[in-house]
Structures are given as structure tokens and as C-alpha cells.
Amino acid sequence: AGVFELQIHSFGPGPGPGAPRSPCSARLPCRLFFRVCLKPGLSEEAAESPCALGAALSARGPVYTEQPGAPAPDLPLPDGLLQVPFRDAWPGTFSFIIETWREELGDQIGGPAWSLLARVAGRRRLAAGGPWARDIQRAGAWELRFSYRARCEPPAVGTACTRLCRPRSAPSRCGPGLRPCAPLEDECEAPLVCRAGCSPEHGFCEQPGECRCLEGWTGPLCTVPVSTSSCLSPRGPSSATTGCLVPGPGPCDGNPCANGGSCSETPRSFECTCPRGFYGLRCEVSGVTCADGPCFNGGLCVGGADPDSAYICHCPPGFQGSNCEKRVDRCSLQPCRNGGLCLDLGHALRCRCRAGFAGPRCEHDLDDCAGRACANGGTCVEGGGAHRCSCALGFGGRDCRERADPCAARPCAHGGRCYAHFSGLVCACAPGYMGARCEFPVHPDGASALPAAPPGLRPGDPQRYL
């Protein structure tokens, strides 16, 4: 038994162009949290397969509000470790998925909204009890930096947490053949129940008398390293078991570079040159492939058949982001024309069109005048999805069917009298006024406000302008 511990160091924009926009805004403050899922072995399991080794959820991070115009910084993180307890032996090799989630704290109906910001996955070798392993993973434009380790819970010890420790029976030393339990020097190893000679570092047992090997080791007692390539090191004595040279003391012996990386010695240590798709101190950090199921919400994974080639998610309409994890408000793109109302139904987009328009995007302007006649010599005018008639003089109404009373609106000003006429109306003006609608006063001195009186009329005559 033991605990896998994950420490998130930073989550923010990765290097290079195309920095992501901040996931939070002044209008929509948010906070981050993380989820880790662990599976045993290096098998290519579906993303949905259960987290057989366990899973954990972090606390919520501090609330963050974007500074307008500022690039997305490293985002504030939750405190503490993510801890995944495991009950049985630590498998030595494992697969992980780490998801970064955003909790939006705006005025959400029904509580906060959650959305996935990024998801990284990988496969690693790790011995329990070892130091923290550092890692960097990228998901689209985001970069996640983290460390992890597996530690045994007392009384278990060893690289697989299968050896047991017991308090000392004598104060000074352990019993015959039993060693102190590092780092618990005041305790002693419990008597081994594994097969005699089973490697305490590379073997473990769950039944008395057996010796099961951690990945990378073989032989009846798990003392023989599995040779991934023919003898890598020129140093050291030959091993009769494998016919290969056992690694000597040089920093590159045994090739610490994983995933086909090549090792070169440096004055102080070693350096790995990693193949495409891998990076990290020992080339242990791998790219996510399509087999990891990185595309959400129905996204299709294109390319990325192996870690050497980057994958791309083609997102269904309505989703975006490097993993199709962000929902787009498709109505914000204003797809409905001519004032149509947009409805995003999730599986489909619908436009409710105004009268006079049709089509999936209300793009068709119906011929409003088609089949519509205006009576009494009126002409049909299209406009705004509705037809109207421009009526001949003396007629009115929607279809020009009503005989109009031209005097109904009292068009003659200043007390002028209105007379209906076959060609319209005539105003008989009160003394002192003139004009077609009796709108102009006649000045007392006989001058008119008009530039000139119409020919044949003296100022002051009753006006019969038509």
C-alpha cells in the first residue's frame, strides 16, 4: 500500500507563438482545479477506461480575474498535493491523465459552470520511494509543469511497496538476516515471504514463495535487466546470464535516456538527446497521441498516430480549443439574417425568421407583392418583409380599396375651408392667408411671405392652389 503524490507547479501559456487567451475575465471570474487519473501498466487503454490505480481531485484554486489587455499569465493554483492512495503493490509502470478544469463564477443559473481547459496524458516508469520526478506537458497552447512520486505507507517499503517493516524486537539491532528498514532505521524488515533470493529491489510477491518482477527485470529472482538493445555499454564485466555487459559506473551506462534517447556524458553528469516527440531530462516526457483520446465533444483526432507527430482535433461546429473542450456560443456569430432569432439547440442551429423571410438562415426575402394586387390603380411596394400599397389619389387603406376623404385630416391651416375635389382637395383660405394649404400669412402692407405671387393673382385674393 502507498500513495501517489502529484504536485502542480504551474499552469499557463506554453512557449512559442499563439498564446492562449486568459480563461477568466472581469465579467467572468474563475478558478482552476485539477483531476488526476492513474492506470497500471503501459497498455493503450481508452480514455474512458476506469482509473484502476485511483483518481483524485484537487481543491479549488484562488479566484482569478483577468487584467484587461494583459496576456494570460501562469494561473493561480490550488494549495497542496493531489494524493491517490493505492492499496496493492505499486506497479512500477503506470499511465496518467491530468485534467485542468475551470470553474466559472459568474452569474450562472444553477450554480457554477465547469469546463475542461486542458488534458495531458502519458506513460511512465516509477519506483516507489524514489525522489520527485519532474515533468512538463503541453496541451495546445497551454503548458503544465508538475512533479510526482510514489511513496509507501508503513509498514510497506521497497520499490513496489511489497516488503513490510515491523518495530524492532531488540533495542540494538535487527534479528539474524534482517536489515533495518530505511528510512525507518528504528524498524526492521519483516521476514521475507518471497522466494529465497528474490531481488528486494526489482522483485516482489503477493503469495509466499513467489517472485514477480517489476517491468524492466527478468529471471527467476528478477536480477536480470531486460536488454532493450544489444549491449549498450562498453564497460563492466560480462553477464553470463544475458551475454551482455553489465552497466559499469559511468553516468551513461545502462543508458538513462528513455524512449530511444541517446546519452552523452558531461563533466558533471549526462545529457540526453531525445527523438522527436519526447523531451525532459531523460526523454521521459512523451507527446499525447490520438490513441489517448484527446479530442472531446465529438472531436476527430487527425494525425498523431505516434508521439513523433502532433495530433490535431477537428472540432464539430459549436466547439473549439485544441481539444474541442470549449463550447462556442454559435448564436454570437449572428448566423440568422434579416433580423431572424437564433436558437442553439445543441445538436442543431435554428433560425426563427421574421415575416417575409425564409430559409435556414432567413436569407430568402419572400416576394411580398407576389399575388397581391393593389386596387384602384395603387402600386405594390415591397419592404421589410411586408407589402404595402401606394394608393392613387382619393383612395386609401391596406389594398387601396377604401375611398379616401382628403379633408378628413384637416389639411387647411389657419381656419381655411377644405373642399374635396376629383383631383384631390382645395383649400379656401381665410382672409390674411394664402398657399395650397393656407400656410402663408399675407402681410398687412400687402407684401407676401412668398418670394412672388403666382402670376395672375394679386396678394390678398382667395387662394386655390392645387
Partner: antibody
């Protein structure tokens, strides 16, 4: 209701280019991905490729070197061109839209048989 | 690419019987992105299920879809005369999009 209709010559000579057009009604071409699928007589379905109005395309690797798919948003149409055809390209060619829930095929055209023969 | 193998190739049953169709993938179909189609002679295929188990519009509930990983199943609980057709599965998790070879459900 989305409706699709394939059109184009039913007979193409070997080594020539097969050209088909799919006319879409009941949906805007900019709302979906649009795809071509074919089915040789008496055989199963084979995906050819798809296009999005933005220009994103993806093709079946087995046909990629010979396929062009284009879209005409003004006519609400998309087209397929398959070059250097052989008799093995004889098939019923379907156009279809890809669903909003993922890259499966929601609505299909009725299909058009293209025979490659001299 | 993901190869989908459908079995059996032909299923001979009588109306009212239960039909069980299998679709097996050469590698895990990520996120259960698998669809089923029905095709009748002279017609285009018709979508039955997506996401392995989500029924498409207007599909009767005698049809059910299930499965994850590499194994998927389409069940027709009681065959109706109009159900005799060819059924195809299709994965849409990893490009290229691929179809199974089909299962023909014929009248016994």
C-alpha cells in the same frame, strides 16, 4: 430538414477526372462539415473526405493524392474531384453532412452511380 | 487506421426474433465515438446511433446500442419486416473515418 442532392456525369473514362456536385437545401453550408462517401456495387462504405466552409479538409489517406473537395457558399454547394480514375472507382457516390455531435453522418444524399469505363 | 470487423456477415432470422450484431475494433475507439447505420437496397444509409448508445432522431426503441473500447453491439429486440437490411458501424474517434464491412440481416 436538411436535403442533399448529388449531380454529375454517370460515366467517366479511365484516367480522366470524376467531378460531382452536392447541392444542399434546408441548411446553410457554413453550419456543418460536408463529406463524400462511396460504395462500390455490392460492397461496403468507404469515406472519401470532408470539408468545412472555413477551408478545413481531411481525406482518406488511400485517396488523398487524387481527391479535391471544394465548397461554394454562395450556391450552397460542395464538390468532389477524383483524378486519374480506374474501374476500381466505379461506385455509388454519396454526399452527406457530418453531425454537430461528432464526425458521423447525419443526412445523406440519395447517391449517384458513377461508372468508370472506356 | 482503426479496422472495424462486423460479425456475423449474415444473420438469418424471422420477424419477432432478437438480432445481435457485433462490431469489433482493431484498437480502442476513443470516447466511444462509434455510430451505427441501416441501409436498405437502393437507398442511402440512415443513422441509427452515435456515441455507441445515443439513439438518432425517429429511431424506434426496439433498437439499442452499447459497448466501449473495442467491442460494440447493436441489438434489435424484436425484428419488424422493415428491419431486414444491412447494418454498418463507423468509428469517428481517429482519422481516417472507417466503416465496418456490414452485417446483412435477412429473413429466414
Amino acid at each position: 430538414q436538411v436535403q442533399l442532392h448529388e449531380s454529375g456525369p454517370g460515366l467517366v473514362k479511365p484516367s480522366e477526372t470524376l467531378s460531382l456536385t452536392c447541392t444542399v437545401s434546408g441548411a446553410s453550408i457554413s453550419s456543418y462539415y460536408w463529406s463524400w462517401i462511396r460504395q462500390p456495387p455490392g460492397k461496403g462504405l468507404e469515406w472519401i473526405g470532408y470539408i468545412y466552409y472555413s477551408g478545413t479538409t481531411n481525406f482518406n489517406p488511400s485517396l488523398k493524392s487524387r481527391v479535391t473537395i471544394s465548397v461554394d457558399t454562395s450556391k450552397n454547394q460542395f464538390s468532389l474531384r477524383l483524378s486519374s480514375v480506374t474501374t476500381a472507382d466505379t461506385a455509388v457516390y454519396y454526399c452527406a453532412n457530418l453531425a454537430l455531435t461528432g464526425f458521423h453522418f447525419d443526412y445523406w444524399g440519395q447517391g449517384t452511380l458513377v461508372t468508370v469505363s472506356s | 487506421q482503426i479496422v472495424l470487423t462486423q460479425s456475423p456477415g449474415t444473420l438469418s432470422l424471422s420477424p419477432g426474433e432478437r438480432a445481435t450484431l457485433s462490431c469489433r475494433a482493431s484498437q480502442s475507439v476513443t470516447r466511444g465515438y462509434l455510430a451505427w447505420y441501416q441501409q436498405k437496397p437502393g437507398q442511402a444509409p440512415r443513422l441509427l446511433f452515435y456515441g455507441a448508445s445515443n439513439r438518432a432522431t425517429d429511431i424506434p426503441d426496439r433498437f439499442s446500442g452499447s459497448g466501449s473500447g473495442t467491442d460494440f453491439t447493436l441489438i434489435i429486440s424484436r425484428l419488424e419486416p422493415e428491419d431486414f437490411a444491412v447494418y454498418y458501424c463507423q468509428q469517428y474517434g481517429i482519422s481516417p473515418l472507417t466503416f465496418g464491412g456490414g452485417t446483412k440481416v435477412e429473413i429466414k
